[in-house]
Amino acid sequence: EPPTACREKQYLINSQCCSLCQPGQKLVSDCTEFTETECLPCGESEFLDTWNRETHCHQHKYCDPNLGLRVQQKGTSETDTICTCEEGWHCTSEACESCVLHRSCSPGFGVKQIATGVSDTICEPCPVGFFSNVSSAFEKCHPWTSCETKDLVVQQAGTNKTDVVCGPQDRLRA
C-alpha cells in the first residue's frame, strides 16, 4: 500500500517518501525505487535555508552601495546575506532593500532614541525645563541653565527652543 503521508524531512512523490535536501543543498533527482534523493550543494553566492525540494538555490541578496547599503553579515550556503545601511542612514523596510538619511530632530525637540542601521531617529518634544535650539540627529533636550546655582537670576525665561538668560541680581541702593 503506497504511503499517503511521509515523515518529517520527507516528501511524497510517485507514491514514495523521499528525503528532503538539507539546508545548503538543492534537489537534483527525486528518490527512486533504487536510489536516495540526489542533492547538490548550492553554488557560490547561493543559499537554501530550509530542508527542501527546490531545484534551484536562491541568490544571496546584493547590498547595493548606490542605495546606501552595505553587508552586515555575509551569506552562507544556508543563510542569506544581511544588509544594513551606511553610517547616518537607516533601512526603509524590514527587508532593508534601500536606505534613507536619519531624520534630525528640529529645535524644540530632542533625540529620544538615536537611529540605528534599521531604525530611524525617535524625537520627543522638550518638556518644561528643557530645550533644544538645534536640528540634530544626536542631541537630546538640554536642561535649562540653573541661574540660582551661579548666584544669578533669570532675566529671560527659557522655552522649548531657548535656554534661560541669567543675569546679576539687582543690588538694593543704600
Epitope: 510517485n14 528525503s19 537534483v28 533527482s29 527525486d30 527512486t32 525505487e33 533504487f34 536510489t35 536516495e36 540526489e38 547538490l40 531545484t55
Partner: antibody, heavy 113, light 112 residues
Amino acid sequence: QVQLQESGPGLVKPSQTLSLTCTVSGFSLSRYSVYWVRQPPGKGLEWIGMMWGGGSTDYNPSLKSRLTISKDTSKSQVSLKLSSLTAADTAVYYCVRTDGDYWGQGTLVTVSS
Amino acid sequence: ELQLTQSPLSLPVTLGQPASISCRSSQSLASSSGNTYLHWYLQRPGQSPRLLIYKVSNRFSGVPDRFSGSGSGTDFTLKISRVEAEDVGVYYCSQSTHVPWTFGGGTKLEIK
C-alpha cells in the same frame, strides 16, 4: 515516452577501447540518473557504473581503471568508454534509468581479433 | 565487494505450485536512511530483465500479486504463490544500497 537506446560497434579487437552511447528520450539527463549493466552470453548480470543526474559518477571497482562514463545533457546522451578490452568483456551492454523499469534493448559487443 | 548469493541455482516447479527463492547478502542492505534497496528481476529468454519487486517487498506496477518479497538485513526471499507458464526464466536479486551495485548469480525456474 521514456526510451533508452544503446549504440556502438558490434565487434572490437582485443586491447582496443570500446565506445558505447546511450541516447535517451522522454526525460532529461539533468534530472535522472542512468547506469550501465552488462551480461556475458549465458551468464549473469554485472553492474558497470552510473552517471548521476548531478553529473557525478560511480564505477564498479573491478572496472574503474579502464572505465569512463560521461554525458552530454544537451544531446541526451550518456557515453561509456572501456579500454584494454579482452575476450572477457564480450557481453550484451544495457543502459538503464535508475527508476521504474526502463532498460535499453541492449547491444551485443564481441571482443575478438 | 558485497556478494549476493542466491539459492537454489535451478528450481523445477509444477504449474500451479508455489516456489521460493532465497537471496543472502554478505552485509546488511539497510541504508542510513532506513531503506533497504533489495530488488528482484525476472529475465525471460532473449529479453532484458524485468523488475518484479523493489525495496524488498514492493511489487512494481503491472506485476501480478502472486509475486511477493520479504526479508530484512541480509536475508531475503521471493515467493510465487502459484507458478504459471509465463514465470519461466532466470530470477535475479539485486542491491543498490552499496556501490558497486551487485546482482545475485541467478535462479533458473523451469516447469517440471
